[in-house]
């Protein structure tokens, strides 16, 4: 009922709560002497559905049959309209339209942990749009029945607040949920289970790992579990992996030996528990334990390469380079590299530990046969040494690979190809492709890169430490026993015209010709491998086309003679540089007048 309804009543039949699709009769009637003041026939009763007028009648009462009401609550209000006055509210009523509850489905109960409480969930089915009460029942041994009622609007979960114990783990319990509203009731199918079926153990806790004698091969995982746990499953993976290793164990009693862990690797470990082989459910996974396995001595051998540089008639500089072992080969933190240099005939040996670098340079006599051995050491031991005999890598001309080419292959890659040497190609044991940034002046501090290629390969894709717009000096070595032959080429992965031309720093006269000297273009402005320099000249104040001389680019060259200038004529000279992509802008201009006699 709405308001006080002093002036009249609104009645609803058959009920204020109706089934969707039903018809209701609404009657609005005035109480005695509550009509219009002057003449009761002028009473006009109006029925509103929310704010919309749906019916009216002159007299003391109004009857209205209403159909098609929507799910939910609809408000009806009856008002009285008299002549020359506002409508007066008489009374009102709310009608609740809904449906009987559907049968609750998929009733399922669980107890989290041996000390937890029993809670059940179910699917309510479609919304009834009415106040619906759910009663959950649990019947079990000793003729006992538990009941819990739900007062929430949308009820699909109830916790009994009681704990099942394992005194008779095979005893049956039966749960059932009943939904009741004004239009009917419905009960779920009963769900029957035992203690072992519904108790989901708590996840294991206090997980620890021990490595006996600091060895990865003697590793035991420890944890704590609830008392009745029979089964465990363990999962573990390196922290940088997405794939888990899985192990199932029975009656582990909180410990398990792991035999296949890799050394010096951070692992993540998790454990889950279950009370019975085929009843019940697995616990959630435990919190992760992260632990690093101990080191083991390195396996594998270092990839070692070297460069020789002539110093003077009696001395040479040897630069050794090696690559880091992979993580799986290093099996620990590499503390130092041990380099041993030995003169093979005299037996003199020198050993040095290198930390923080993967290269080493020393000066040795040019005479004698020299060998080096390099190994990597961690806290547990050293790798097997890589032994190399120092030789003249390019000495054997017949072993030099032929037709070496270097072509850009996509972003920051260079494809190097070659033909086998003329000398019996089957003599080649391996090829080594070496590359380093091209620096005029042959700076030995420039990092060296290399890769090894099998003797039947005639190409290699180099991508490590390759930058766009940088020229690389690339060498291909063919190695055979104690002999080597090599060929070299310049290559870049990406190029464009140089940003500037060479800077002419001097022009000198020599026997009727001139010698032009220039400064190299800075490496960052070369924009790839230079192919040519061009020297341009023309008479000063002349509009004629300049003459030019094109010189193939050579790393060490920075001067060139020109002998076609006329004496006592002032010329303007400048230079440009070219890559495969085009020509640079002019370098600086210099004027010069040849003083020599005319021919």
């Amino acid at each position: 009922k709405i308001d006080a309804c002093k002036r009249g009543d609104v009645t609803v039949k058959p009920s204020h709560v109706i089934l969707l699709g039903s018809t209701v009769n609404i009657t609005c009637s005035l109480k005695p002497r509550q009509g219009c003041f002057h003449y009761s026939r002028r009473n006009k009763l109006i029925l509103y559905k929310f704010d919309r007028r749906i019916n009216f009648h002159h007299g003391h009462s109004l009857n209205s049959q209403v159909t098609g009401l929507p799910l939910g609550t609809t408000l009806f209000v009856c008002k009285l309209a008299c002549i020359n006055s506002d409508e007066i509210q008489i009374c009102g009523a709310e009608i609740f339209v809904g449906v009987a509850p559907e049968q609750p489905q998929n009733l399922s109960c669980i107890q989290k942990g041996e000390q937890g409480t029993v809670a059940c969930t179910w699917e309510r089915g479609r919304d009834t749009h009415l106040y619906t009460e759910y009663t959950l029942q649990l019947s079990g041994p000793k003729n006992l029945t538990w009941q819990k009622q739900c007062k929430d609007i949308y009820c699909d979960y109830l916790d009994f607040g009681i704990n099942l114990t394992p005194e008779s783990p095979e005893s049956n319990f039966t749960a059932k949920v009943t939904a009741v509203n004004s239009l009917g009731s419905s009960s779920s199918l009963p769900s029957t289970f035992t203690f072992l079926d519904i108790v989901r153990p708590l996840p294991p806790w206090d997980i620890r790992i021990k490595f006996q004698k600091a060895s990865v091969s003697r590793c035991t995982l420890y944890w704590r579990d609830e008392g009745l746990v029979l089964l465990n499953r363990l999962r573990y993976r390196p922290s940088n992996s997405r794939l888990w290793n899985m192990v199932n164990v029975t009656k582990a009693k909180g410990r398990h030996d792991l035999l296949d862990l890799k050394p010096f690797t951070e692992y993540e470990f998790q454990i889950s528990s279950k009370l019975h082989l085929y009843k019940g459910s697995w616990s959630d996974w435990s919190e992760s334990l992260r632990a690093q396995t101990p080191e083991e001595e390195p396996t594998g051998m270092l990839d070692v390469w070297y460069m020789k540089r002539h110093i003077d008639y009696s001395r040479q500089q040897i630069s050794l380079f090696w690559k880091n072992l992979s993580v799986s080969e290093a099996r620990g933190k590499i503390l130092h590299y041990q380099v041993t240099l030995q003169e093979l005939t005299g037996g003199k040996a020198m050993t040095q530990n290198i930390t923080g670098h993967t290269s080493w340079t020393t000066v040795i006599p040019r005479t004698g046969n020299w060998a080096v051995a390099v190994s990597a050491a961690n806290s547990k031991g050293s790798s097997l040494p890589t032994r190399i005999n120092i030789m003249n890598l390019c000495e054997a001309g017949l072993l030099a690979p032929r037709q070496v080419s270097a072509n850009s292959e996509g972003m920051d890659n260079i494809l190097v190809t070659w033909q086998p040497p003329r000398k019996d190609p089957s003599a080649v044991q391996e090829y080594v492709v070496e590359w380093r940034e091209l620096h005029p002046g042959g700076d030995t501090q420039v990092p060296l890169n290399w890769l090894r290629s099998r003797p039947y390969n005639v190409s290699a894709l180099i991508s490590e430490n390759i930058k766009s717009y940088i020229c690389y000096e690339i060498r291909v070595y063919a190695l055979s026993g104690d002999q080597g032959g090599c060929s070299s080429i310049l290559g870049n992965s990406k190029h464009k015209a140089p940003l500037s031309g060479p800077h002419i720093n001097a022009i000198t006269e020599e026997k009727g010709s001139i010698l032009i000297s220039w400064n190299s273009i800075p490496v960052q402005e070369q924009m790839g491998c230079l192919l040519h320099y061009r020297i341009y000249w023309k008479e000063r104040d002349s509009n004629s086309q300049p003459q030019l001389c094109e010189i193939p680019y050579r790393v060490s060259q920075n001067s060139h003679p020109i002998n076609s200038l006329q004496p006592r004529v002032t010329y303007v000279l400048w230079m440009t540089a070219l890559t495969a992509a085009g020509e640079s802008s002019h370098g600086n201009e210099r004027e010069f007048c040849l003083q020599g006699k005319a021919n």
């Epitope: 029993v118 079990g140 000793k142 006992l144 538990w146 009941q147 819990k148 009622q149 916790d159 009994f160 607040g161 009681i162 704990n163 099942l164 114990t165 005194e167």
Partner: nanobody, 125 residues
């Protein structure tokens, strides 16, 4: 310390109804589960119904559907509405308060710490 006092017992005909009430003193009433036990002459004390702190109710099968237990924490009372009474319901009815936790603890009188003195219910045929 909790003191319990039952009331509402009496003589009633078979098929009739009675409402037993148990008043508790002490501010910790809502910390306890409450139960009703009964003892017929010459028999052991028998559990019949309980209500947990979270209003879950428990009944022995022989009274299920006839008896309803309820509690009012604001008034520190627990009630047992008994309908469709039978002569075999004749007994002294006791109110008890305790802290049982597991399924099998609730019917055990040893799990209840505080007891009332009882009220007599007689059902005549």
């Amino acid at each position: 310390q909790v003191q319990l006092q039952e009331s509402g017992g009496g003589l009633v005909q078979a098929g009739g109804s009675l409402r037993l009430s148990c008043a508790a003193s002490g501010r910790t009433f809502n910390n306890y589960a409450m139960a009703w036990f009964r003892q017929a002459p010459g028999k052991e004390r028998e559990f019949i119904a309980a209500i947990t702190r979270s209003d879950t109710t428990l009944y022995i099968d022989s009274v299920k559907g006839r008896f309803t237990i309820s509690r009012d924490n604001a008034k520190n009372t627990v009630a047992l509405q008994m309908n469709s009474l039978k002569p075999e319901d004749t007994a002294v009815y006791y109110c008890a308060a305790g802290m049982p936790y597991s399924y099998s603890d609730y019917p055990r009188d040893s799990k209840y710490d505080y007891w009332g003195r009882g009220t007599q219910v007689t059902v005549s045929s």
